[in-house]
């Protein structure tokens, strides 16, 4: 049968008839920077190409791993999963390998900042498709390594790169910290998170999403026609290469911020079990596991958005913490998360000339999150009219004045240490969805967006009693752009979205005081963009066989059990 | 051990062709810092990444360079540089001793310095 | 779950042959490597050699190179390991072990429950 | 071939004592060290990888480090049934090769 990994990442539709894309990514390069590879293995023979790059640092003990087959292992199967022949998931993809690490999988940040260097020096000198770079390595936190990450990203490169095998914040390490970076974590076949020993894969913010990386099958290095399982976020990583490969085949044109937000997309939902992670990292890890899409045409039309969160502001009374949004994405609305519910709200806000979200911490708080929704909202122009505290006992409330601008979403930010539950819940007047409203003693921010063809609804969730937890979930077709709770009373502990669904949280239900004190509404803001609906017809009805559901219809690859190619 | 002489040569040299003080001083009130990584045993001291700001150009980079060789040779210190960056970011790499950071992080066009660290296979 | 069971002892005489099987259960048996180590009544651990079920690749200890025959049935996923010219200091524990890779390290995380051979005339 | 000396060969303990033992290399193996315990006529078990990595279910008093040519197994407080025998194995280069073992008895 097919391998678990390659059946996971199958859209559902093809997975009863074991289809296998023959060429997928045939368009695009892919580097590798790892160990040496044995490049005339029959899994990659012809695909991987050995550039002459090599910055290694000395193997610490005089022997160890000198034998040829165990320096090359870790390469070896890393190529092997994005592009090989019969266990590879991007089979059309051709590679280039660059040695970076020893063998003893050991390299250096300046060793790895000079392959990079080499790989944009080489896209200059002779430009060719879309490039995906793999880094399946890890080192501490480093300033360097994700400045030039940055600057290779924007370059218009897409790097995927290991979370990293220490059972510990992301964001600690490097290159997995780095925000333009598409940072994968590792889930076994039960889709657990991969644990080893004390070790496993590592969490957080800073990982985009989730891919199988344990017990994978791949080229083995022992012999050219060898296979065997390896375990690690690297293999995780080279899974969403090989994805990322293909998309790219088959959508040439798309940007790093269209193809994270495809990922993202198109990855399995909330299949992860989240206890494995501390507890103060849950909500921050993405539970998605990566698969590749269905079809590539039909996406287009989406109003894609994503998560973004900030990092922990600190808890002293003035911290704040920032969430930013890529240059290409529109921030269409931010909000704000405190476990000790002491927060003073959050506010969108100009920085170099775009928006970000910002959240401020509170007297006697631990410090908040800022929590941006970071969405693909092409030709958008959208701006923060915001209402000062209302005198007036209703509350505070601000609209989008402007002609043919929609509501995205909805902030609110106080000055005051707390707000106190005593006042009456605000309710939102009835007919009047295009506005925010909030607590009088609260300045409120309104997120308010033109761009063709959209148009935003406000979805309501409120519950009278009090309950830790409040959703809220756009409809099919809709994409939740805003997430915020009313009232902003102090015992709501923040909004985020997660996915398509708001989620307001509580403080625990017996900290709380009465039903009436405890009444939350957790309020969605959904958009669509009939616009983009509008395009991407017009594209299918131009366009035919380069999308991934006809690479998929293409060809039946029966999977051979590795044996019978010995002979 | 050539290497090494090879090295000295061209210091001074350096030394000859270099006013001697900081003719580029940094610009006032923006002060270059030095990073290194959080986990010792990962650490590399001795080689360090000197990022310069983001729109110095190449020859201002191997200038950069040259002087603080020439300014480390003055002090009684020998320093290889390992590698010009261009391309990506701007700056160097350079073999030096600890002693001679507070010098390097006074040079012209120095945004920071770090420290070089380990990666591994994951 | 998991496991390596390896058939019953042996008794043979010096010069003969002992072939000794190890089948898999709970996973891929073509991933990962199977090696093989003895252990002599009362002593160490000796490393013996590797199969790895996925083709014919082995790799030996050069003090058994010339006795020693690793074969697989990746049908049955057993994997075999045979010694020739046996002598009477071949009498040990013979145990087949499950080789993991994780990230860039390499251990033995499964063992079979051993083979007792005795070589005595 | 590259020789694992453990020492000590066998050593007397009661239960809550700090037990160690080392293992020294005859030349660099970096990091590349397992250590195993083994009770009279079971199959050895893995314990820690990588010279300091503890493996899944092992618990936490036990305890690896070192690298290059010394390293040391470390049981914080022995229990009942810690009493086993250890080896260390080095699979640095071939041929993988073991230490004699140390013998950890009730005193």
């Known amino acids: 049968s097919i391998p678990w990994n390659l059946e996971r990442i199958t859209p559902p539709r093809y997975r009863a008839d074991e289809y296998q894309p023959p060429d997928g990514g045939s368009l695009v390069e892919v580097y590798l920077l790892d160990t040496s590879i044995q490049s005339d293995h029959r899994e990659i023979e012809g695909r991987v190409m050995v550039t002459d790059f090599e910055n290694v640092p000395e193997e610490d003990g005089t022997r160890f791993h000198r034998q040829a087959s165990k320096c090359d292992s870790h390469g070896t199967h890393l190529a092997g999963v994005v592009s090989g022949r019969d266990a590879g998931v991007a089979k059309g993809a051709s590679m280039r390998s660059l040695r970076v690490l020893n063998c003893q999988g050991k390299g250096t940040v300046s060793g790895t900042l000079i392959g990079l260097e080499f790989i944009r020096k080489s896209q200059l000198v002779q430009p060719v498709g879309p490039l995906v770079v793999l880094l399946p390595l890890a080192g501490g936190y480093s300033r360097v390594l994700n400045a030039a990450c940055q600057r290779l990203a924007r370059a218009g490169v897409v790097l995927v790169t290991a979370a990293g095998n220490f059972r510990d914040d992301a964001c600690l390490y490097s290159p997995a910290s780095a925000p333009e970076v598409i940072t994968v974590g590792a889930t076994n076949a039960q889709d657990q998170p991969v644990t080893l020993g004390t070790l496993g894969t590592n969490f957080g913010r800073c990982v985009d999403l989730f891919a199988p990386g344990e017990d994978i099958i791949g080229a083995s290095s022992d012999c050219s026609t060898c296979f065997v399982s390896q375990s690690g976020t690297s293999q995780a990583a080279a899974h969403v290469a090989g994805i990322a490969a293909m998309m790219l085949s088959a959508e040439p044109e798309l940007t790093l911020a269209e193809l994270r937000q495809r990922l993202i997309h198109f990855s399995a939902k909330d299949v992860i079990n989240e206890a494995w992670f501390p507890e103060d990292q849950r909500v921050l890890t993405p539970n998605l596991v990566a698969a590749l899409p269905p079809s590539t045409h039909g996406a287009g039309w989406q109003l894609f958005c994503r998560t973004v969160w900030s990092a922990h502001s600190g808890p002293t009374r003035m911290a704040t913490a920032v969430a930013r949004c890529a240059p290409d994405e529109e921030l269409l609305s931010c909000s704000s998360f405190s476990r000790s519910g002491k927060r003073r709200g959050e506010r969108m806000e100009a920085q170099g000339g775009k928006l970000v979200c910002r959240a401020h911490n509170a007297f006697g708080g631990e410090g908040v999150y800022a929590i941006a929704r970071c969405c693909l909202l092409p030709q958008a122009n959208c701006s923060v009219h915001t209402a000062p505290p209302a005198e007036a006992s209703m509350g505070t409330r601000v609209h989008c004045h402007q002609q043919g601008h929609v509501l995205t979403g909805c902030s609110s930010h106080w000055e005051v240490e707390d707000l106190g539950t005593h006042k009456p819940p605000v309710l939102r007047p009835r007919g009047q969805p295009n506005q925010c409203v909030g607590h009088r003693e609260a300045s409120i921010h309104a997120s308010c967006c033109h761009a063709p063809g959209l148009e935003c609804k406000v979805k309501e969730h409120g519950i009278p009693a009090p309950q830790e937890q409040v959703t809220v979930a756009c409809e099919e077709g809709w994409t939740l752009t805003g997430c915020s709770a009313l009232p902003g009373t102090s015992h709501v502990l923040g909004a985020y979205a997660v996915d398509n669904t708001c989620v307001v949280r509580s403080r625990d239900v017996s900290t709380t005081g009465s039903t009436s004190e405890g009444a939350v509404t957790a309020v969605a803001i959904c958009c669509r963009s009939r616009h983009l609906a509008q395009a991407s017809q017009e594209l299918q009805g131009s366009t035919s066989g380069s999308g991934l559901n006809d690479i998929f219809e293409a060809q039946k690859i029966e999977w051979h059990e590795h044996h019978h190619h010995h002979h | 051990q050539e290497d090494e002489d090879g090295d000295y040569e061209e210091l001074v040299l350096a030394l000859r062709s270099e006013e001697d003080g900081l003719a580029e001083a940094p610009e006032h009130g923006t002060t270059a810092t030095f990073h290194r990584c959080a986990k010792d045993p990962w650490r590399l001291p001795g080689t360090y990444v000197v990022v310069l700001k983001e729109e110095t150009h190449l020859s201002q980079s191997e200038r950069t360079a040259r002087r603080l060789q020439a300014q480390a040779a003055r002090r009684g210190y020998l320093t290889k540089i390992l590698h010009v960056f261009h391309g990506l970011l701007p700056g160097f790499l350079v073999k030096m001793s600890g002693d001679l950071l507070e010098l390097a992080l006074k040079l012209p066009h120095v945004d920071y310095i770090e420290e070089d660290s380990s990666v591994f296979a994951q | 779950q998991v496991q390596l069971v390896q058939s019953g002892a042996e008794v043979k005489k010096p010069g003969a042959s002992v072939k000794v099987s190890c089948k898999a259960s709970?996973?891929?048996?073509?991933?990962?490597?199977i090696h093989w180590v003895r252990q002599a009544p009362g002593q160490g651990l000796e490393w013996m050699g590797e199969i790895l079920p996925s083709s014919t690749y082995t790799k030996f200890n050069q003090k058994f190179k010339d006795r020693v025959t690793m074969t697989r049935d990746t049908s049955i996923s057993t994997a075999y390991m045979e010694l020739s010219r046996l002598r009477s200091d071949d009498t040990a524990v013979y145990y087949c072990a499950r080789e993991r890779i994780y990230s860039n390290y390499w251990f033995f995380d499964v063992w079979g429950q051993g083979t007792t051979v005795t070589v005595s005339s | 071939d590259i020789v694992m000396t453990q020492s000590p060969s066998s050593l007397s303990a009661s239960v809550g004592d700090r037990v160690t033992i080392t293992c020294k290399a005859s030349?660099?193996?970096?990091?590349?060290v397992a250590w195993y315990q083994q009770k009279p006529g079971k199959s050895p078990k893995l314990l820690i990888y990588?010279?300091?990595n503890r493996y899944t279910g092992v618990p936490s008093r036990f305890s690896g480090s070192g690298s290059g040519t010394d390293f040391t197994l470390t049981i914080s407080s022995l229990q009942p049934e810690d009493f086993a025998t250890y080896f260390c194995?080095?699979?640095?280069?071939?041929?993988?090769?073991f230490g004699g073992g140390t013998k950890v008895e009730i005193k």
């Open positions: 030349q660099n193996v970096y990091t590349a």
């Open positions: 709970g996973y891929t048996f073509t991933g990962y490597t």
């Open positions: 194995q080095q699979y640095s280069s071939y041929p993988y090769t």
């Open positions: 990588s010279a300091s």
